[in-house]
């Protein structure tokens, strides 16, 4: 019999040599070992060269082996999981050449004082990195640049005083970040970028609350639902968020998220966010676009936060408590009327696919009741918006286009947001935000608005199409009018042209955030409901075949909004794919939306 016990797990031969008082690798290890447990032995040093002939080796456990040095002088081409935890390693050699397939690396509970800049070079498959409970005082810039697939990063229980500002750059898959129990005083501006991190642990640090903490404070406010207090032996999914666990060491342990920041400058340069301090407690809208195709999944969200100028944003942030568990893979951008320039990231693979588009617009009304009506009301100053709804269903074999326009008119001085899926005309001063299904562009400060273009190309053998409506509202005091173009191209052999409507209105001075709404749909259903005591809800479902071409990502000051904030869970557009062999028109998403 072997010194070590042998079994098999998921087709891998598992050899367990734990706690056998070994000082070296056993001589009788099976050549086809796939999982090797060498933990709790007295190996002292270990060389990967000793395992190069084990060509099936996928998991290697070297925990609690009293290791003081590791040599990566032999290539283990299949090794995916390496456990070096609970040893005495003071440094790590470069691992990429020897372990190119590594997905999980655990070097926790060692004596690492620092890491060399290229220690992770070549670890392109790494998904989990555990460095907790070491003596790390700093991290080299670019440490994680090679590990673009990283999902879990644990840096807890170290002596980190600061973090490199670009540490998380490019880590789009990161979902869990442990930074608790370090000596951190602040978080660099822009540190989290546009990442949505469902699980973050930040407690037990030396957070110093002064004006430098404002970026971090705002991030905590926006991600309150994703900040947790770590408890030993408790799965994070079984705990509740605890943003208050992040406390100011210099202010009687007051929560960082509620730090008032009195006297601090409020320009976006100071916070790496748009200026939130001048936005009142008013209803907010949020539009999200989620793309997922039958190829590699990518998800992109936009958000709009629109409000009239007022005093402070702090109270609003606190008044929007998160309620749900986080959802992964959702990058969400918030924009206000402050400058910034954002387009959809150029991350989606362009692939002709069948999509289902669902637009869900929910606007939170002021404390008033809304009654739908189909009659035109006199535009007197009142607080009841008049809602006119229309429902269109195009039968399968119809060969005649059915033009439809849903027009919602809000009376003067209304402060109630009204959802729309077609044309929205806002007379006189108003604070009505409008969702968009196209690409969102926020301009730098300029007196010249940007033109808006919507282009739709329909497939060749098309028999029925529904009109495309593009609406743009420009504030009166724009010094240059904004040309709006809605261009529809119907290729040869299409039996029916598609009517296109482009409406341009220029109301009185307004702080309304208004965006192009473009609908492209052979089958269009618009439903407007106003149940008692619930937000107005508009649902638009579209099915179309398309190839998506996205604008390049431009430099942007953006921030993340927690996906799960129930008060901000507003318009949502979901593009969900399914396989199809139908012909595919091309939807060019180079629409842009003017933000006054």
């Amino acid at each position: 019999q072997h010194t070590c016990s042998i079994s098999k797990v998921t087709s891998l031969l598992e050899v367990n040599c734990e706690n056998k008082k070994l000082t070296a690798l056993p001589a009788d290890l099976p050549a086809d070992t796939g999982i090797l447990h060498l933990g709790e032995n007295q190996l002292g040093t270990f060389s990967t060269a000793s395992l190069v002939h084990f060509t099936h080796l996928t998991y290697l456990y070297l925990d609690r082996c009293e290791l003081t040095s590791l040599q990566t002088n032999g290539k283990l081409i299949k090794l995916e999981n390496l456990d070096l935890s609970h040893n005495n390693l003071k440094s790590l050699p470069s691992l990429g050449w020897a372990l190119p397939a590594l997905t999980t690396l655990d070097v926790s509970f060692n004596k690492l004082g620092s890491l060399s800049p290229g220690v992770l070079d070549g670890l392109s498959q790494l998904q989990e990195l555990y460095l907790q409970n070491n003596d790390l005082k700093s991290l080299p810039p670019g440490l994680l640049l090679p590990t673009t697939k990283l999902k879990k990063l644990n840096l807890a229980n170290n002596k980190l005083r600061e973090l490199p500002s670009g540490l998380l750059d490019g880590l789009e898959d990161l979902d869990t970040l442990y930074l608790q129990r370090n000596w951190l005083r602040t978080i660099p501006k822009g540190f989290f970028g546009t990442l949505l991190l469902p699980f973050v642990f930040l407690h037990a640090n030396s957070w110093y609350c002064d004006c430098e903490i404002l970026y971090f404070r705002h991030w905590l406010q926006e991600n309150a639902n994703n900040v947790y207090l770590w408890k030993q032996g408790v799965d994070v999914k079984d705990t509740t968020p605890n943003v208050a666990s992040v406390r100011c060491a210099n202010l009687d342990n007051a929560p960082v998220y509620s730090y008032p920041g009195k006297g601090c400058p409020t320009s976006s340069g100071d916070t790496d966010y748009d200026d939130y301090d001048d936005i009142p407690d008013v209803p907010a809208t949020r539009t999200e676009v989620k793309f997922s195709t039958n190829t590699k999944v990518h998800t992109t969200h936009w958000s709009l936060l629109a409000a009239a100028p007022s005093t402070s944003q702090d109270s609003q942030m606190i008044s929007l408590p998160p309620t749900h568990k986080p959802t992964k893979k959702q990058s969400t951008f918030i924009h206000t009327q402050s400058p910034g320039f954002t387009t959809l990231p150029e991350t989606m693979e362009s692939n002709p696919t069948f999509y289902s588009l669902k637009l869900n617009t929910v606007l939170i009304p002021s404390p008033t009741t809304l009654e739908p009506t189909s009659t035109q009301a006199t535009p007197e100053p009142n607080i009841q918006p008049m809602l006119t709804t229309s429902t269109l269903t195009t039968p399968e074999h119809s060969t005649t286009p059915v033009p439809t326009t849903t027009i919602l008119t809000t009376p003067e001085h209304s402060t109630i947001p009204v959802p729309t899926t077609a044309i929205l005309t806002t007379p006189k001063p108003s604070t009505i935000p409008v969702p968009t299904t196209a690409t969102l562009t926020t301009l730098e400060p300029s007196t010249t608005p940007v033109p808006t273009t919507a282009t739709l190309t329909t497939p060749e053998p098309s028999t029925t199409l529904v009109p495309t409506t593009a609406t743009l509202t420009t504030p009166e005091h724009s010094t240059t009018p904004v040309p709006t173009t809605a261009t529809l191209t119907t290729p040869e052999h299409s039996t029916t042209p598609v009517p296109t409507t482009a409406t341009l209105t220029t109301p009185e001075p307004s702080t309304t955030l208004t965006n192009l709404v473009s609908t492209i749909s052979p089958v269009l259903t618009t439903t407007l409901t106003t149940p008692e005591s619930t937000p107005i809800e508009t649902i638009l479902e579209q099915f179309f075949t398309t190839e998506l071409t996205l604008l390049p990502t431009l430099e942007s000051t953006t921030t993340i909004i927690p996906e799960q904030n129930s008060f901000l869970n507003l318009p949502e557009v979901a593009l969900v794919s399914s396989d199809t062999s139908e012909s595919s028109p091309f939807l060019n998403s180079d629409f842009c939306c003017f933000l006054p």
Partner: antibody, heavy 118, light 113 residues
């Protein structure tokens, strides 16, 4: 076609030994993991031992230390050496082939009966 | 060890009618690395050795009629026979091939009514 033929079964007293053989044909024997599975009279199936194509054996606790699986690739033969036999080892012993590195059994022999009785 | 529990233990069937056998494991048989469930089904006809029907939960062995199908994930699995034929009688076993020791269910005896 794949064929597995077991032999060596019989009646044996408790505490004694027996060696089963399985002659394989119709496939490249050395490339496949092989196993022994038994079935007590009127009962279900129970895995007894396996050996990888590289010759690594592994067992359930019930036979560990008593049974030894081995193979002779030059003879295309699988063996099961059974020592310290007990009454509860009475069963039909099947030789079975595993699919590649996986551990389901795609071909079975007709079985050989081992009876442990005093 | 992973315990496999089958039900029912006896299943009287009518030819041409569908039949279904359940198999539950005491722990998940899903391998997160490849998203495969490591479960196989065998039929042992009277007086014969077992024959492989299905592996990895739903992959039919070559030569097995398409009236046999497997489904399930994690700990709950099902073998379905869409239209039972007389030759389908025997004892059906599920087996987990997730981790050794490989274990079988106690068997379900399918017989014609």
């Amino acid at each position: 076609q794949v064929q597995l033929v077991e032999s060596g079964g019989g009646v044996v007293q408790p505490g004694r030994s027996l060696r089963l053989s399985c002659a394989a044909s119709g496939f490249t024997f050395s490339s496949f993991a092989m196993s022994w599975v038994r079935q007590a009279p009127g009962k279900g199936l129970e895995w007894v031992a396996s050996i990888t194509s590289a010759g690594t054996p592994y067992y359930p606790d019930s036979v560990l230390g008593r049974f030894t699986i081995s193979r002779d690739n030059s003879k295309n033969t699988l063996y099961l050496q059974m020592n310290s036999l007990r009454a509860e080892d009475t069963a039909v012993y099947y030789c079975a082939r595993s699919r590649g590195y996986e551990d389901y059994f795609d071909y079975w022999g007709q079985g050989t009966l081992v009876t442990v009785s005093s | 060890d992973i315990v496999m529990t089958q039900s029912p233990l006896s299943l009287p069937v009518t030819p041409g009618e569908p039949a279904s056998i359940s198999c539950k494991s005491s722990q998940s048989l899903l391998n997160s690395r490849n998203q495969k469930n490591y479960l196989a089904w065998y039929l042992q006809k009277p007086g014969q050795s077992p024959q492989l029907l299905i592996y990895f939960t739903s992959t039919r062995e070559s030569g097995v009629p398409d009236r046999f199908s497997g489904s399930g994930s994690g700990t709950d699995f099902t073998l379905k026979i869409s239209r039972v034929e007389a030759e389908d009688v025997g004892v059906y076993y599920c087996q987990q091939h997730y981790s050794s020791p490989w274990t079988f269910g106690q068997g379900t005896k399918v017989e014609i009514k």
